[in-house]
C-alpha cells in the first residue's frame, strides 16, 4: 500500500539503485516515486554532514522485501516511494530554494526582476529543467537579477552548494503550467534524427510518447513497429533530443513512428501509466513471482498490489490454467519496460497500475458564512481541491467554497446549504482559479446528496460540516485532485504553515473575488481563541486561526472552504471556513470546523453512502 | 500499393455456412494484425474479429463467438472468415482491413463483400 | 465492452460551415481513438488516429481532439466532398468498438 510516513535522523542501509543531488527530502522522494526500480529513499541535507559531496545526496533504494535496516544519522530524512498513492503521485514541485544554488549546464542567462519570472521563463524554455536567481542583494554586482536556465544529464542538478542570495528552484511543466503547447500528432512512416538519450521496449507508440513525456531528457521519440524490418530493432522506442528542442531532421520510414513528448501542453499531461492490456503479446523480463488468477484484469491488479512489479503477462496456454485460473507471470526489468515483446503469443500483457495517479475511488486520510482579505492571488494547480459551490435560480452566483476529498466527495460548510437544501439548485465547479472563466459551456458536478452533519443545527456555530456526494466522479488531473484529511483526533501535530483558500470578500463590505486568493494565517489555540470570543463556546471541535493585529482572513464566500497545512511535505485538510466576527479584525480570529474531529463521521458517511470503504490511509 | 479484396459473399439460407476470403496485395501480409468489420444494410460499422501476424492469437466480438473462426495463410497472403449457423442478423456488408501496426488504428480497407442470410 | 456514442446523429450543414462531431467512451480510453470517414457505397476511410493525428492525404481542414472519454472531430470549413457519415472507433480494447454514426448532410 501507500507509505507516506518520513523518518528523521534515519538513514536507510544498502540497497542503492541511484543517487543525484536533490534540494530537500521531498524532491527526493518524488524522483523516487518516477524511478523503476525505487521504493525507498535516504536524503541527506547540508546542515547533517560535513563531507561536501554528500551534501544534498539523495539516495534511491529497492529492497525485495519492502524494507531495509535503518541507521541513525542526524539530520537524514528517510521514506517511502509514492509508487500506489494515487493522487500524490506528481512530477509537479513548485518549492523555491532560498540560498541554494542548483548547478547543471547553463544555456541561458538573461536579467529578470523576481525569482517567480525566472521560474516563469525556465517553464517557457523547452530545454530548462531547472534553474538558479541571483537576488538584488548578490554579493557580486554583475550578477545580480540574473536568471540562470539550467539542464543535465539525469534532469536533477549535478551538484547543490549553499550560496548566500540565491534562489533556485526547478520548470513548472511538469505542472501543466508551460506556454510553449504541445504537439500531439504521432507521424507514420516518419522516423526523427538527432541525439537518442534512451532506448526502451514497447507495445505501441502510446506508451512510447507517455515515458518520453516523463523522461527528464526526451524531447520527441521514433518507434520502430512490430513489423520493422530488422527484427533486432521491433518495438524499440528511441527517446530523443536536440539543441534547438526539435528535430532537425525527418526521413520517410516505413514502420516507424515519431512524435512528441507532452511534458509541454498546457492544462493536462498524460497519466505516468500505462492502462491498456494487450491482448497476443507476451512481455519478457525478470522473475517477480508466478500466481494463478482468473482473468487478465486480476492480474494487472495483482502487479499493481505488488509494489515491486513493473509489468506482466498472463498466460492463456492450457498447461498454464488450472480451472478458471491461469499463469500471471509478475515481471519487471532495470529500465521498467519489458526486455523482450512477442506477439501472437497465447496470453495477454500489460503494466502495474502503480504510477496511476487517479489513485482508487476513495478519499484520502492518513494515519463562514464567513473572502480572504489580505490575501494574494493564486495560481494555476496551487489548490487544486479547492471547489466553487454555485447556486443557479434566477442568475448563478458563487456561495461557498469546499474541498475535494475523493472522485465523488466534496466537504464543506453545513451553513452554506441553510435555506438552500435543495440538491438540483447547485453546481460545484472544481479546476478553476477565475470564477470569470465560467461560461455556460464549463462544465460543472451536480449534486447526488447533501449530507449536513445530524447535530448541526442553523445560525449555531456548532458541528458546521457538510458532505456533498457527486453525481458523477471525477477525474483528477494536476489541478482538480484531492485534499488529504488529518488523522482521526489529531492533536500531537503542530502546524506551522497553514493557508486559507476562496473566492470571498476582500473586505468586510465587498464582493466575491474572480481569482482564487490565498492567505498564510497562523493558527491560535483554543485557548487564546476563546478569549476573544468570550460570547460564544469555542469548543474541542472548531480550530482558530488568524493574525494578533488582523489584517488577514477568511470572509464572506470563503465559507465551507479549506484551511490547509502543510507538514512533512504534504497538505491536510485541517479545517473547514466556517464563522468569525466580521473579517480580519483585529484580535478576532477566523473559526473553522476541526476535520481530524470529524474522521469518523467522514467515514461512517463516505462508506455507508457505497455500501464499501471509501477511505485510504497513506500511512 | 495496398490492396485487399473480399470475396465469398452471397445468398445463404439461416443456420448454413459461409467461408469469406480477402486477398492481400502491397504489403508484407505476414506482419500484420488483420480485422474483419462488417457492416448491416443502413446501419453502422462493428468490428468482428482480429487476427495477429502468426495466427496465434484471435478475437472476436461477443455477436459472433463461437460461429465464426478468423484464419490466414500467410504463404498465400490470404485472410479467412469462416462462418457457420449463420443468422438473418449476419446479413452485412464484410470488409477485409489492415490495422495500423503501434497506433491501434485500420489504415487500410477492403471494398466489402455482401453476406445475405435469407430463406 | 466501451460503448462509443456519437453526437449528433446527423446534421445538416452548408459548404464553408465549420462542423463539430463529439464522440463520448463509457469508460476512459486515453488517446486510442480514430476517426473514420464513409460515403454510400465506399469502405469506411481512415481520417484520423491516436485522438488528433491526421492520417497521410487527408486534408488539414479535418482536426481531432480529446483524451479520456471525450473527443472531437472538427472541419473547419466544410467541403461539397465531406458529405459523408463519420464513425469513431476505440482501439483500447477489445471488441474494438464503433461509433453509431453521424451523418453530415447538405442543408
Known amino acids: 500500500g501507500c507509505l507516506t510516513q518520513l523518518y528523521e535522523n534515519a538513514f536507510f542501509r544498502g540497497g542503492d539503485v541511484a543517487s543525484m543531488y536533490t534540494p530537500n527530502a521531498q524532491y527526493c522522494q518524488m524522483r523516487c516515486t518516477f524511478h523503476p526500480r525505487c521504493l525507498l529513499f535516504s536524503f541527506l541535507p547540508a546542515s547533517s554532514i560535513n563531507d561536501m559531496e554528500k551534501r544534498f545526496g539523495c539516495f534511491l533504494k529497492d529492497s525485495v522485501t519492502g524494507t531495509l535496516p535503518k541507521v541513525h544519522r542526524t539530520g537524514a530524512v528517510s521514506g517511502h516511494s509514492l509508487k500506489q498513492c494515487g493522487h500524490q503521485i506528481s512530477a509537479c514541485h513548485r518549492d523555491i530554494y532560498k540560498g541554494v544554488d542548483m548547478r547543471g549546464v547553463n544555456f541561458n542567462v538573461s536579467k529578470v526582476s523576481s525569482v517567480e519570472e525566472c521560474q516563469k521563463r525556465c517553464t517557457s524554455n523547452i530545454r530548462c529543467q531547472f534553474f538558479s536567481y541571483a537576488t538584488q542583494t548578490f554579493h557580486k554586482a554583475e550578477y545580480r537579477n540574473n536568471c540562470l536556465l539550467k539542464y543535465s544529464p539525469g534532469g536533477t542538478p549535478t551538484a547543490i552548494k549553499v550560496l548566500s542570495n540565491v534562489e533556485s528552484g526547478f520548470s513548472l511543466k511538469p505542472c501543466a503550467l508551460s506556454e510553449i503547447g504541445c504537439h500531439m500528432n504521432i507521424f507514420q512512416h516518419l522516423a526523427f534524427s538527432d541525439v537518442d538519450v534512451a532506448r526502451v521496449l514497447t507495445p505501441d507508440a502510446f506508451v512510447c510518447r507517455t515515458i518520453c513525456t516523463y523522461h527528464p531528457n526526451c524531447l520527441f521519440f521514433t518507434f520502430y513497429t512490430n513489423v520493422w524490418k530488422i527484427e533486432s530493432q521491433r518495438n524499440v522506442c528511441l527517446l530523443k533530443t536536440s539543441e534547438s528542442g526539435t528535430p532537425s531532421s525527418s526521413t520517410p520510414q516505413e514502420n516507424t513512428i515519431s512524435g512528441y513528448s507532452l511534458l509541454t501542453c498546457k492544462r493536462t499531461l498524460p497519466e505516468p501509466c500505462h492502462s491498456k492490456i494487450y491482448p497476443g503479446v507476451d512481455f519478457g523480463g525478470e522473475e517477480l513471482n508466478v500466481t494463478f488468477v482468473k482473468g487478465v484484469n486480476v492480474c494487472q491488479e495483482t502487479c499493481t498490489k505488488m509494489i515491486r512489479c513493473q509489468f506482466f503477462t498472463y498466460s492463456l496456454l492450457p498447461e498454464d490454467c488450472k480451472e478458471e485460473k491461469c499463469k500471471c507471470f509478475l515481471r519487471l526489468s532495470m529500465d521498467g519496460s519489458p526486455t523482450r515483446i512477442a506477439y501472437g503469443t497465447q496470453g495477454s500483457s500489460g503494466y502495474s497500475l502503480r504510477l496511476c495517479n487517479t489513485g482508487d475511488n476513495s478519499v484520502c486520510t492518513t494515519k463562514t458564512s464567513t473572502r480572504i482579505v489580505g490575501g494574494t492571488n493564486s495560481s494555476w494547480g496551487e489548490w487544486p481541491w479547492q471547489v466553487s459551490l454555485q447556486v443557479k435560480l434566477t442568475a448563478q452566483r458563487h456561495l461557498c467554497g469546499g474541498s475535494l476529498i475523493g472522485h465523488q466527495w466534496v466537504l464543506t460548510a453545513a451553513h452554506c446549504f441553510d435555506g438552500l437544501p435543495l440538491q438540483d439548485v447547485w453546481r460545484i465547479y472544481s479546476g478553476i482559479l477565475n470564477l470569470s472563466d465560467i461560461t455556460k459551456d464549463t462544465p460543472f458536478s451536480q449534486i447526488k446528496e447533501i449530507i449536513i452533519h445530524q447535530n448541526y443545527k442553523v445560525s449555531e456555530g456548532n458541528h458546521d460540516i457538510a458532505l456533498i456526494k457527486l453525481q458523477a466522479p471525477l477525474n483528477y488531473t494536476e489541478f482538480q485532485k484531492p485534499i488529504c484529511l488529518p488523522s482521526k483526533g489529531d492533536t500531537s501535530t503542530i502546524y506551522t504553515n497553514c493557508w486559507v483558500t476562496g473566492w470571498g470578500f476582500s473586505k468586510e463590505k465587498g464582493e466575491i473575488q474572480n481569482i482564487l486568493q490565498k492567505v498564510n494565517i497562523p493558527l491560535v489555540t483554543n485557548e487564546e481563541c476563546q478569549k476573544r470570543y468570550q460570547d460564544y463556546k469555542i469548543t474541542q471541535r472548531m480550530v482558530c486561526a488568524g493574525y494578533k493585529e488582523g489584517g488577514k482572513d477568511a470572509c464572506k464566500g470563503d465559507s465551507g472552504g479549506p484551511l490547509v497545512c502543510k507538514h512533512n511535505g504534504m497538505w491536510r485538510l485541517v479545517g473547514i471556513t466556517s464563522w468569525g466576527e466580521g473579517c480580519a479584525r483585529r484580535e478576532q480570529p477566523g473559526v473553522y470546523t476541526k476535520v481530524a474531529e470529524y474522521m469518523d463521521w467522514i467515514l461512517e458517511k463516505t462508506q455507508s453512502s457505497d455500501g464499501k470503504a471509501q477511505m485510504q490511509s497513506p500511512a | 500499393e495496398v490492396q485487399l479484396l473480399e470475396s465469398g459473399g452471397g445468398l445463404v439460407q439461416p443456420g448454413g455456412s459461409l467461408r469469406l476470403s480477402c486477398a492481400a496485395s502491397?504489403?508484407?501480409?505476414?506482419?500484420?494484425?488483420m480485422h474483419w468489420v462488417r457492416q448491416a444494410p443502413g446501419k453502422g460499422l462493428e468490428w468482428v474479429s482480429w487476427i495477429y501476424p502468426s495466427g496465434g492469437w484471435t478475437e472476436y466480438a461477443d455477436s459472433v463467438k463461437g460461429r465464426f473462426t478468423i484464419s490466414r495463410d500467410n504463404s498465400k497472403n490470404t485472410l479467412y472468415l469462416q462462418m457457420n449457423s449463420l443468422r438473418a442478423e449476419d446479413t452485412a456488408v464484410y470488409y477485409c482491413a489492415r490495422d495500423a501496426p503501434g497506433v491501434g488504428a485500420i489504415d487500410y480497407w477492403g471494398q466489402g463483400t455482401l453476406v445475405t442470410v435469407s430463406s | 465492452d466501451i460503448q462509443m456514442t456519437q453526437s449528433p446523429s446527423s446534421l445538416s450543414a452548408s459548404v464553408r460551415d465549420r462542423v463539430t462531431i463529439t464522440c463520448r467512451a463509457s469508460q476512459s480510453i486515453s488517446t486510442y481513438l480514430n476517426w473514420y470517414q464513409q460515403k454510400p457505397g465506399e469502405a469506411p476511410k481512415l481520417l484520423v488516429f491516436a485522438a488528433s493525428s491526421l492520417q497521410s492525404g487527408v486534408p488539414s481542414r479535418f482536426s481531432g481532439s480529446g483524451s479520456g472519454t471525450d473527443f472531437t472531430l472538427s472541419i473547419s470549413s466544410l467541403q461539397p466532398e465531406d458529405f459523408a457519415t463519420y464513425y469513431c472507433q476505440q482501439s483500447y480494447s477489445t471488441p474494438h468498438t464503433f461509433g453509431q454514426g453521424a451523418k453530415v448532410e447538405i442543408k
Open positions: 502491397g504489403f508484407t501480409f505476414s506482419g500484420y494484425i
